[in-house]
């Protein structure tokens, strides 16, 4: 029939819905409104998806779930009198005198409006998880938060297993009653209570609304606790690690919180729903009307069908849940929503060799002994590519991959990074910049765009910084144009002459060996090992130094390692780093110390890759808890995550150089993890794979 079926989640809501339906009918509003009884917002969402109901108003978190799990969309938004359009902002407040930042929250005392409340819990906790600051194992968010902060007041957390920590700062009412209640009995409950918790020194940070500080300071508050408070004594924590004045909430917040919205199926004519409700609000939203759309007083409840503070309903232009929620809130929800019942009991790790199987088996046992979740299972495959296939086919869940394999995993198999490896800052062999080094020469200076016809020095054929990245970058930029996918010939024709040591010189263009010198006796010319004096990154730099070549493609550390007395070999002993420069992609030249801004690409760290439907926060949560126990190579807990010496191998499961597993943060895609320059170089090379 021609009706819109509204889903009610309780008896009072059903009652109000019936009255709204009747009021609309009497006013001749078309189409007619019918009421369907659901048991909860979740149930209503299921009824709508199954076409047994058509519409319901939801909060941000529920809109996220409804959109992600059922493809529902928001079509009508609520606007509130006191707020900023269709939203408000979640902020983190600290005392101006403190030194806390968003990056130093671990261990501080925290004040929250209440458990599972939007700005007091969902947004800050979700944000901390999503940004990688807070790791959660096995979906146990409460445990993670209780371990993270140095005591909290989270009204309503008294019934949880972590009440000791989460209710530690709560104080109840003046007679000590109602400690940690999710009600006004707890003095630190709600927006003003959480702020009071901070103001009275119980906590170091309060998670509240953008207007909370200004509403409770500068003489605006009646209770005695707030009489003397000044807004200038408080500051906001910004996402970038800075702090700001409490009036700067538009720029400095954790997330913009979307208003509640009416959601419907993805193919529903949202305009029709808005016209129906608009007719209704035109007649039934003011004081004297027979039915009050935005009041729940008559039913002894609050916020039935719509929030009572709604001043009007507006149509939503871009009808997608992502657009309505906004990226900040969306990201926070991604971090927060983890359903323990849907968490797989196992994480199946892909292994590629007998030693790796052995190490993985030991890892599984070690993790199980420490009750880490999910449990590890080891599944073998023949190659990294085979791992990718098996992960895509849902036979395996995770594997650690190198840069080139991450590219394939993302591009061909749709996998995403869940965690990354982090190496020591001084470790340049595992994550480094690829640079083009030239002699500082004012009379014959040339740029990256003028390399044609120059002499080039390369570490070796197939080496990342010596071949793959520079050649890929030059192909991608259109300087080298291979015919019939013949990259070798194209490179040999692009440069006047080169030294590109190689192991299998069959059909190898002679000009790619023209600059090579072999060993001291002049033998082993152009071989792919250290017998060729111009082999490797040190050799490629030597090729430049000895004026055999005009440009050397090396790592960013190569110049430093071989100048200023760092290499005592005769060819390097007198070299000074300031005699060399880098060629930048923008056509400029730069000092060798400027490698971070002037490079062809950064070789990315290895990353753990998973299917896009895998909860990456549970993967990182597991690895983070595991590395606390097993990450130190000298730990006494019976297993070493980042050491393979016990298994007669190297770089098993993780690179041995790994210092920590790290969250991916905002680098949630293979392109994000690899970086645009590295991807461009790989795309240059892969465009030639015919």
């Amino acid at each position: 029939g021609m009706e819109v079926r509204w889903c009610a989640t309780s008896d009072p809501e059903q009652h109000k819905c019936g009255n709204m339906s009747e009021a609309f009918r009497e006013a001749g509003i078309q189409p007619s409104l019918l009421c369907v009884r659901g048991t909860s917002a979740d149930h209503c969402v299921q009824l709508i998806a199954a076409q047994e109901a058509d519409a319901i108003t939801l909060d941000g978190g529920a809109i996220y779930e409804a959109g992600k799990e059922h493809g529902l969309k928001p079509v009508v938004g609520e606007v509130y009198d006191q707020e900023v359009g269709t939203s408000y902002y979640a902020v983190a407040v600290v005392r101006r005198s403190s030194h806390v930042t968003i990056d130093t929250l671990k261990g501080v005392k925290s004040c929250h409006t209440g458990i599972n409340r939007t700005v007091g819990w969902n947004v800050p906790v979700g944000y901390l998880v999503e940004s990688g600051r807070l790791s959660v194992m096995g979906c146990d968010v409460l445990k993670a938060v209780s371990d993270y902060f140095g005591g909290s007041c989270v009204p309503g957390a008294g019934e949880t297993s972590y009440s000791e920590s989460l209710c530690r700062l709560c104080r109840g009412d003046s007679s000590g009653e109602g400690v940690c209640d999710k009600s006004p009995l707890e003095r630190y409950y709600d927006y003003s209570g959480a702020f009071r918790c901070l103001a009275e020194g119980a906590g170091d940070v309060a998670f509240v609304k953008h207007s909370t500080v200004l509403e409770n300071t500068d003489g605006k508050t009646l209770p005695s606790w707030g009489q003397a408070l000044l807004s200038q004594d408080f500051e906001l924590l910004c996402r970038d690690g800075s702090r700001a004045d409490v009036t700067e909430w538009r720029q400095c917040h954790l997330a913009r919180v979307p208003a509640h919205a009416v959601v419907v199926r993805a193919d529903t004519d949202g305009g029709l729903i808005f016209r129906l409700l608009n007719e209704g609000q035109r007649l039934f939203s003011h004081e004297g009307s027979s039915f009050q759309m935005f009041s729940s007083e008559a039913y002894g409840q609050k916020d039935l069908l719509f929030k009572d503070s709604t001043s009007e309903l507006v149509p939503i232009a871009t009808q997608t849940y992502e657009a309505w929620l906004g990226h900040e809130y969306l990201h926070a929800m991604k971090g927060l929503l983890c359903d323990p019942n849907r968490l797989p009991p196992y994480l199946r790790w892909c292994v590629l060799s007998t030693p790796e199987i052995q190490k993985c088996g030991d890892m599984a046992v070690a993790f199980r002994r420490q009750r880490l979740k999910p449990e590890i299972q080891c599944v073998s495959a023949k190659s990294p590519q085979h791992c990718m296939e098996r992960i895509q086919a849902e036979q395996v869940d995770a594997v650690t991959l190198s840069g080139e394999d991450i590219y394939t995993a993302g591009k061909t198999y749709g996998l995403v990074p869940a965690a990354g490896e982090h190496y020591a800052p001084e470790d340049s062999s595992n994550s480094y910049y690829v640079v083009a080094v030239v002699r500082r020469d004012s009379s014959h200076a040339f740029t990256l765009d003028e390399l044609r016809g120059k002499r080039s020095c390369h570490a070796g054929f197939g080496s990342p910084a010596g071949w793959d990245v520079p050649v890929g970058a030059l192909i991608q930029r259109g300087f080298i144009r291979p015919k019939d996918c013949d990259v070798l010939t194209a490179v040999s024709e692009f440069f006047n002459a080169s030294c590109v040591p190689v192991n299998n010189p069959k059909n190898y263009p002679s000009s790619l060996c023209a600059l090579c010198v072999g060993d001291e006796q002049g033998r082993n010319k152009c071989v792919g090992n250290s017998q060729e004096r111009y082999y490797g990154y040190r050799g490629a730099f030597r090729c430049l130094v000895e004026n055999a070549g005009d440009v050397a493609f090396v790592r960013h550390t190569t110049v430093f390692d071989n100048t200023n007395g760092h290499n005592s070999e005769p060819w390097a002993a007198e070299l000074r780093s300031e005699d060399y420069e880098l060629l930048c992609p923008n056509g400029a030249r730069a000092e060798v110390s400027q490698f971070a801004a002037c490079n062809l690409a950064q070789i990315p760290p290895h990353a753990v890759m998973v299917r896009p439907d895998t909860n990456i926060f549970t993967v990182y949560g597991l690895l983070d808890k595991a590395q606390d126990l097993f990450g130190d190579d000298h730990n006494k807990n019976g297993f070493k995550m980042f050491d393979s010496s016990n298994y007669h191998g190297q770089d098993l499961l993780f690179k041995d150089a790994t210092v920590r597993a790290v969250p991916v943060g905002e680098k949630t895609t293979y392109r994000g993890w690899l970086g645009l320059d590295y991807v461009a170089a790989l795309e240059g090379m892969s465009s030639q794979q015919c």
């Epitope: 029939g1 021609m2 819109v4 078309q30 189409p31 998806a49 199954a50 076409q51 058509d54 059922h70 493809g71 419907v264 199926r265 993805a266 193919d267 529903t268 004519d269 949202g270 305009g271 029709l272 016209r275």
Partner: antibody, heavy 119, light 107 residues
């Protein structure tokens, strides 16, 4: 009885224009989304345009900027103005009603009107 | 754009048999899938929407199933009037796309 009757199909030269009409009856036209769907000579079905009950239009990239869909609520008529016609626009054009509340699932199809674009 | 891949392209069966036609979406479309039947020289008719809800007047021998990206239409005990071409279509959003069709012929 629900009826959708298309008209206006014809033989037209590439680059030419044509306006299709669809007369709707037997249902509350104002409250339903409507669409045009075409069927190519190879029998492939292709979505051409949709219009919500309130008049918001949606088009695929292949016809965007060339075709314009509109509706006349007073006369219960749907229109499709087709400009810059190409040979690949040759097809049987169906006027289709969206299901109740739905923009894109289609519960009633007219008999179609034939459009041939050829020099 | 979401691609809809239907299989098989054609199918021969006898009256009384049970047949299944499948449709795969190139990305998740939840349950937003419709099936249409078209007989020679006639307009298409809606059979199933929302992946498994039968349209008004459609016999119960037709049933739709699936969600996400994989869907199927099953016809139990084929009747003579069931022969024709079947199309799937997603109704998740724009652009709307159809499968290439499955021609069901009498063996």
């Amino acid at each position: 009885e629900l009826k959708l009757v298309e008209s206006g199909g014809d033989l037209v030269k590439p680059g030419g224009s044509l306006k299709l009409s669809c007369a709707a009856s037997g249902f509350s036209f104002n409250n339903y989304a409507m669409s045009w769907v075409r069927q190519t000579p190879e029998k492939r079905l292709e979505w051409v345009a949709s219009i919500s009950s309130g008049g918001t239009t949606f088009y695929p990239d292949s016809v965007k900027g060339r075709f314009t869909m509109s509706r006349d609520h007073a006369r219960n008529i749907l229109y499709l103005q087709m400009n810059s016609l190409r040979s690949e626009d040759t097809a049987m054009y169906y006027c289709v009603r969206g299901q109740w509340l739905s923009l894109y699932s289609m519960d009633y199809w007219g008999q179609g009107t034939s459009v041939t674009v050829s020099s | 754009d979401i691609q809809m891949t239907q299989s098989p392209v054609s199918l021969s069966a006898s009256v009384g048999e049970t047949v299944t036609i499948t449709c795969r979406a190139s990305e998740i479309i939840y349950s937003y899938l419709a099936w249409y039947q078209q007989k020679q020289g006639k307009s298409p008719q809606l059979l199933v929407y929302n992946a498994k809800t039968l349209a008004e007047g459609v016999p119960s021998r037709f049933s739709g199933s699936g969600s996400g990206t994989q869907f199927s239409l099953k016809i139990n005990s084929l009747q003579p009037e069931d022969f024709g071409t079947y199309y799937c279509q997603h109704h998740y959003g724009v652009p709307v796309t159809f499968g290439a069709g499955t021609k069901l012929e009498l063996k």
